[in-house]
Amino acid sequence: DSSKWVFEHPETLYAWEGACVWIPCTYRALDGDLESFILFHNPEYNKNTSKFDGTRLYESTKDGKVPSEQKRVQFLGDKNKNCTLSIHPVHLNDSGQLGLRMESKTEKWMERIHLNVSERPFPPHIQLPPEIQESQEVTLTCLLNFSCYGYPIQLQWLLEGVPMRQAAVTSTSLTIKSVFTRSELKFSPQWSHHGKIVTCQLQDADGKFLSNDTVQLNVKHTPKLEIKVTPSDAIVREGDSVTMTCEVSSSNPEYTTVSWLKDGTSLKKQNTFTLNLREVTKDQSGKYCCQVSNDVGPGRSEEVFLQVQYAPEPSTVQILHSPAVEGSQVEFLCMSLANPLPTNYTWYHNGKEMQGRTEEKVHIPKILPWHAGTYSCVAENILGTGQRGPGAELDVQYPPKKVTTVIQNPMPIREGDTVTLSCNYNSSNPSVTRYEWKPHGAWEEPSLGVLKIQNVGWDNTTIACAACNSWCSWASPVALNVQYAPRDVRVRKIKPLSEIHSGNSVSLQCDFSSSHPKEVQFFWEKNGRLLGKESQLNFDSISPEDAGSYSCWVNNSIGQTASKAWTLEVLYAPRRLRVSMSPGDQVMEGKSATLTCESDANPPVSHYTWFDWNNQSLPYHSQKLRLEPVKVQHSGAYWCQGTNSVGKGRSPLSTLTVYYSPETIGRR
């Protein structure tokens, strides 16, 4: 209806004596802003005066001033939208109807709100889910139709009077739609919570009790059972009787069926709360429990372990591990079904009793080949001694033992011979399947464990073989001791350290790298001529004539070896210089004369100097001095000087005679 003011607020607000009430409220006036506001308690319309009668709790004046006695009631609204109110503290006699008398310039309205104030704090309300099952998380909700900014409260959960310290989530609502405080508790109830009292306690800011609501938990759960057995220790001998009784300590809802299980399997035709076992056999040993079901599901009791005692059965031996590797540890386990467990054991190795071995396990920390064989045992308990079973075989595996490399050839072995070796061993488990040789070579193995070396090398010093099964065992290497002629024979100059100059003392050494046998002889030769039989060839004062090609030979009983030819070079200053003339020492003027400086030098002459009869050096430095045309004045004695890196040499004088030509004579 467009002729109405529009208000939104909770229909009824709840509080208690001494608390407060907060009234969320919104409105929309028909026209303009609010000019006057009066809050009535239980207003009644007076037709005579056309006004409302009742207690005025709050009154706003045009100037907006509020009388001091109205401090308890506060209008927190505004002139066009908000009509929120607060009463603090609220009293019991505030209960009833609050009338909000609103006036604008032209319109008036009375809005009614119910206020319910109780003498004591009213209780919250617990809401439970329709069904609660054990171990399934549920949310418990506690709702209180109260919230006020000026009066802090809290909702606390208790279980059997003790605070529950699971995390509860508290929320408050102070809206035009609803005013409440709510606490939600997530909780996983156990069967033992069935029938327990849960309390939601309303508390003041100091945690003190104001009011509460309680509920009794109805936790649906499978039957909870207790099993009792006679005899109580559940230990009997074959032929005895046993009684088991199943008691239901709790079930919600009531149980419907009963059954018994042995080792997890249902026992046929056993559907009562008592299980009677008469004249038990050892096969009836095992774990027994009773199972009782209700609509939630089956519940099982704890297991009772029934032990039917009997003497040990024939024993078997378990070996950890066979085959065993020599040096490893091995454990033997004597297995014999018996109840009670055997207290004593007797062990046998190859039928012979093993002294001092009375335990269920025999541990050998380091297995040796002689430990191989058949192991058996006998178990004994308070009811008797068992029989010896068939036993178990221990296979001890080990690498080939005492491996040797044997040379089949007659000794000594010479370079180039064919050598045959064999690889021998004493024992092996498992059998030898292959052989290895060191060093590796392109050698033949004509049969397993035999090696043939064709054309044996001088440097084949040692050979070792390995015999292999799952492991390889290496023999100590054997020396072939191959004999050979001296090797790497070469000439080495010992002195001088630098180049050889004429007149030096010179020593040459005949070197070789190896020889077998070691006893050797030396020979020196030059140009096919034997010079000496020592390892060294010595020259006290070397001359250029000693230069040439030298070789040395070294021989032993196997053969002889020559060095490469070694060239001995002797350096000397120019010598035997002479001047030769061409065409001769007498030349006619006008012709050509060539003077040549001839010499013997090592290294060759690098520089020539020419001199005339006055010992004047001429401006010519080559080996030949060419005079063309030759003049009579050129007649005279000439000599030359040659220089190399070692020194200088000079020639004797050679005379050149230049005679007049017939023309010159004719002119005279």
């Epitope: 208690w16 605070p163 310290r165 009011s211």
Partner: antibody, heavy 119, light 112 residues
Framework: QVQLQQPGAELVKPGASVKLSCKTS????????MQWVKQRPGRGLEWIGR????????HYNENFTTKVTLTVDETSNTAYMHLSGLTSEDSAVYYC????????????WGQGTSVTVSS | DVVLTQTPLSLPVSLGDQASISCRSS???????????LHWYLQKPGQSPKLLIY???NRFSGVPDRFSGSGSGTDFTLKISRVEAEDLGAYFC?????????FGGGTKLEIK
Amino acid sequence: QVQLQQPGAELVKPGASVKLSCKTSGYTFTIYWMQWVKQRPGRGLEWIGRIDPHSGDTHYNENFTTKVTLTVDETSNTAYMHLSGLTSEDSAVYYCARRDYSYYVLDYWGQGTSVTVSS
Amino acid sequence: DVVLTQTPLSLPVSLGDQASISCRSSQSLVHINGDTYLHWYLQKPGQSPKLLIYTVFNRFSGVPDRFSGSGSGTDFTLKISRVEAEDLGAYFCSQSTHVPYTFGGGTKLEIK
């Protein structure tokens, strides 16, 4: 049995701070609010404030709001009171006490820590 | 804050005598829930206070029955029917109805 253990004494310089501990045993720490009380010779007992060990929520006596901070360590079941800006007026014995959740009474008290503020 | 006034300040007694201590509150200690949170403690020299009586008249566990509490609203009394040597010390009343909690000034029970 319920026990609240406090160190015997603390000597502090003026202006400094001190953190007093109260180690509990023999009960579920988070269920009971922990209260702290001050006692000066000839001045009686003064309630300082309380803490809920479960939520950490605190409430202080207005006379102590700027002086005191209450905390707890759930893992070690220990409550702490931090006193700052110490003066000679803060020299006193400080007790921690457990508040019962049904009758709101301080049912078990620690032996108290004597704090002396002196340069 | 609620003020608790204890009288007398000092109470000299002979062993075997009855003793009575009064505690007056500046305002009612009845909580909105109807309970009255007025308690009594005994503090022996060098020790912490020990709870004797809670919520006016309930004896704490292990407290002998010679101790009794009574009162309502603003006036409360602690009585010791036959004083024994171990009862000597300072007695305090305390309220936990209003926050902050407050304590009386104490009454020293001593041998005459």
